[in-house]
Every structure is written in structure tokens, then in C-alpha cells.
């Protein structure tokens, strides 16, 4: 699987999850998030050669098409597969609120 | 929605579904598919600016991150959202077989 266990331990050029730390205040301008200060959102990148973690029949077909027609602009793209939530603390006035934001952390990628 | 109804009628630079005809024999080397000869598989392409048809919170965050950090390599990617099946005819020896291949035709895209 193109997950953090594999991708963070290997120098993988093709589609894989990459570490990306986002600071809420500095990188997003989100001053309202008090905790955490930032988090590893991660991201997916890298070429999607034929059959590499193909998400659907279409991505398999497109991967093969791209292999046999290298000049074509159509090719699958490396995108998140498994995502995990992130729990944040913020304030509404003086009242603290804890919320779980879904799909915030990329754990693995796929070619779609 | 970034679907064929919208994308095929507009000159859209950003993420949208694009027409792509694939000939099974010529483009994929699939001699075993006898009908149809080919089909519109379509594909997704184009930049994913902040908030454009964002698939998850992560793609929204990444889109914003990319807007505020234009030099960053991390950005959402335009990929298929809705796909439709394709019915094909092939032969196993002298016996005709009809099969519905799932997720073969891209009908709309999203930023993921």
C-alpha cells in the first residue's frame, strides 16, 4: 500500500504519500484554531505508471493508454486514498469547543 | 458540477472532464474486445484553485495552502468523481461473452 509506513521509509519517485506539515496560523491564516498549532496533513504526489495502485478500471485503462501513447496529456493522478480526522480546539467567545474535522490527514495514496 | 454537460460546453481551464476517445485495439492493444471498437473514456485535467469542487476537508486545506504558498509543490489534483460502466462483447474461444466493466467512463471530476 502507498501509505505512510511504506512511503516515509522509501525514496519513492512514483505516486506516494509525502510529509507536509501545515501551521494553521502561518500557512493558512487560521488564527481561530488554538490547538494544535499545526499538523501533518501530508499530500500525494508522483507519477502514476500503468497499474500502480489503480483506483478504478478507468485509471487502469488510462495508465495503459498513457504508457502506449506517451505524448498524451491524459494520465492518472496521485491523490489521497485513506484519510484520518484531526481533533482541534477553538473558542466561540469564551467557550472552548472541541471538534473533530474529518478527512484532514492523508495516510495513503492511489492513482485515480 | 464539473460534469460533461458543463465541461464539454465551456472553455474551462480549471479542473474539468475532457473528452478522450480510446480505441481498444490501437490505443490499448486489446484485440480481445470485439464490440465496441472504442469508447469515450474521457479524463480529468486542469488546475484546482482553492475551493474548486473540493472533495474533502484535506483538499480544501491543501487548496488554501497552495494559494498562500504558491511555491509549494503540494496541491489538489483533478480526478474522476462519477464514473459509468461500459458493456463489451468478447469471445472465449467460440463462445460470445458480454460483460459490464465498471467505472470505465468519466462523467464528472473533482479536486482531491
Amino acid at each position: 500500500a502507498l501509505d505512510t509506513n511504506y512511503c516515509f521509509r522509501n525514496l519513492e519517485e512514483n505516486c506516494c504519500v509525502r510529509p507536509l506539515y501545515i501551521d494553521f496560523r502561518q500557512d493558512l491564516g487560521w488564527k481561530w484554531v488554538h490547538e494544535p498549532k499545526g499538523y501533518y496533513a501530508n499530500f500525494c504526489s508522483g507519477p502514476c505508471p500503468y497499474l500502480r495502485s489503480a483506483d478504478t478500471t478507468h485509471s487502469t485503462v488510462l495508465g495503459l493508454y498513457n504508457t502506449l501513447n506517451p505524448e498524451a496529456s491524459a494520465s492518472p493522478c496521485c491523490v489521497p486514498q485513506d484519510l484520518e480526522p484531526l481533533t482541534i480546539l477553538y473558542y466561540v467567545g469564551r467557550t472552548p469547543k472541541v471538534e473533530q474535522l474529518s478527512n484532514m490527514v492523508v495516510k495513503s495514496c492511489k492513482c485515480s | 458540477a464539473l460534469d460533461t454537460n458543463y465541461c464539454f460546453r465551456n472553455l474551462e481551464e480549471n479542473c474539468c472532464v475532457r473528452p478522450l476517445y480510446i480505441d481498444f485495439r490501437q490505443d490499448l492493444g486489446w484485440k480481445w474486445v470485439h464490440e465496441p471498437k472504442g469508447y469515450y473514456a474521457n479524463f480529468c485535467s486542469g488546475p484546482c484553485p482553492y475551493l474548486r469542487s473540493a472533495d474533502t476537508t484535506h483538499s480544501t486545506v491543501l487548496g488554501l495552502y497552495n494559494t498562500l504558498n504558491p511555491e509549494a509543490s503540494a496541491s489538489p489534483c483533478c480526478v474522476p468523481q462519477d464514473l459509468e460502466p461500459l458493456t463489451i462483447l468478447y469471445y472465449v474461444g467460440r463462445t460470445p461473452k458480454v460483460e459490464q466493466l465498471s467505472n470505465m467512463v468519466v462523467k464528472s471530476c473533482k479536486c482531491s
Epitope: - | 484485440k31 470485439h34 464490440e35 458493456t87 462483447l89 468478447y90 469471445y91 472465449v92 474461444g93 467460440r94 463462445t95 460470445p96 458480454v98
Partner: antibody, heavy 119, light 111 residues
């Protein structure tokens, strides 16, 4: 260009044998089933024997009229299909065509070879 | 086995005539939206030639005056304007199941 060249036809006595050959070129012979179709004088076309590719285990078919007397075989290394005809009868007199059917239809045909069974 | 019945067995027509030949199968030769019926032209001393495949698709190099239609058990070959070179015998053939079988043929003669 697809070419199918039959040979081996001729005059033979009833009860005798003949071996027809069909040399193929211009297509991926290994991938496709090959057939022998005949036309007897004043009659229509009849599929006599058929052999599919290695992918499908060289499965064969014979019409009831030739079963246990005719044998179809192929040599993929030579791109050639054969029809071994034994115990020939007068009613086997016909033009025998070699043909290839990539997908249900007989797309290409040889020029035919005449087999005459007569005493 | 699926039996194929062609009609008429012979017909006389003139150059320029519209000619229709029918083929009826003893059971359906269609599967899903695919119609597994094919048509051939056969002239004396020549090899048969594929005209129409899968009911309505014109084979390579065949003039557009030839057309095919039908589904299920009933199929038609039409020659919109008969030409001198079209006088021949025409056969239908199915590939719905093994064995594939031919119709008895329709001989198109000059009136």
C-alpha cells in the same frame, strides 16, 4: 495484407485420405481461431471443422457429417492449419476454404482447394 | 444447434432494384445489445466475402449500398440499388454459440 493459401486438394478414391494445409500470413495467427468451411456442388456453405487458439486450449469442433473422420490441427510456429481427411466419401466432394474468424464473423478466406472423391 | 433459414432461396432482379434478403434464426442470436449475425457474398469460382458483421456493421471495403438490420431472431440484408457485380449468392451466419452455422443461401440472379 492477410493471406490464406490452401493446398492439398485433389482427386481421391472413396475410403481414401487427404491432408489439406492452409498457410496464413499478415495477421497474428497465434491469437485467432481457424476454420475449414466447404461448399459441395449445388449446396451452401458448411462449417466443417474449427480450432481455437492456444489461449483456449486448442478446442476443436467438427460437424456431425465429418466427426471421427476429419481432424483439424494447427502449427502456430508455421502459421499453418491442417485438415486431415480420412475415410472420404463421395459427399465430401467440395471446395474447401480456410478461414479466420477473429470475432464471430469469418473475416478472411482463402481461395479454396477442390477435393473430389470419386472412383 | 441454431438453425438459420434464409428467404427467398433465390430471386430475380434488375440493375437498380432494391433487394431485401431475410434470415431467421431458430432462437435469438442477440446477447445484450449485440446482434451476432453476419452476412457474406459468394460468387462462383471465388472465395466468400464478408459484407456485414454483427447485423449492421459494414465490413472494410464494402460499398454503402449494402446494409444490414435486425435483432433477436429476424435479420435483413438490403442492397439499396443492385449493381451488375452484386449478382451472387448471399449467406447469413450466426456466432451466438458453438457451432456457428450458415443459412442455406439466397441466389440473386439477373431478371
Amino acid at each position: 495484407e492477410v493471406q490464406l493459401l490452401e493446398s492439398g486438394g485433389g482427386l481421391v478414391q472413396p475410403g481414401g485420405s487427404l491432408r489439406l494445409s492452409c498457410a496464413a500470413s499478415g495477421f497474428d495467427f497465434n491469437s485467432y481461431g481457424m476454420s475449414w468451411v466447404r461448399q459441395a456442388p449445388g449446396k451452401g456453405l458448411e462449417l466443417v471443422a474449427d480450432i481455437v487458439s492456444k489461449t483456449y486450449n486448442y478446442t476443436t469442433y467438427y460437424s456431425d457429417s465429418v466427426k471421427d473422420r476429419f481432424t483439424i490441427s494447427r502449427d502456430d510456429s508455421k502459421s499453418t492449419v491442417y485438415l486431415q481427411m480420412n475415410s472420404l466419401r463421395a459427399e465430401d466432394t467440395a471446395v474447401y476454404y480456410c478461414t479466420v474468424a477473429p470475432g464471430g464473423s469469418f473475416d478472411y478466406w482463402g481461395q479454396g482447394t477442390l477435393v473430389t472423391v470419386s472412383s | 444447434d441454431i438453425q438459420m433459414t434464409q428467404s427467398p432461396s433465390s430471386l430475380s432482379a434488375s440493375v437498380g432494384d432494391r433487394v431485401t434478403i431475410t434470415c431467421r434464426a431458430s432462437q435469438s442470436v442477440s446477447i445484450s445489445r449485440f446482434n451476432l449475425m453476419h452476412w457474406y457474398q459468394h460468387k462462383p469460382g471465388k472465395q466468400p466475402k464478408l459484407l456485414i458483421y454483427r447485423a449492421s456493421n459494414l465490413a472494410s471495403g464494402i460499398p454503402s449500398r449494402f446494409s444490414g438490420s435486425g435483432s433477436g431472431t429476424d435479420f435483413t440484408l438490403t442492397i439499396s440499388s443492385l449493381q451488375p457485380e452484386d449478382f451472387a449468392t448471399y449467406y447469413c451466419q450466426h456466432s451466438r454459440e458453438s457451432p456457428w452455422t450458415f443459412g442455406g443461401g439466397t441466389k440473386v440472379e439477373i431478371k
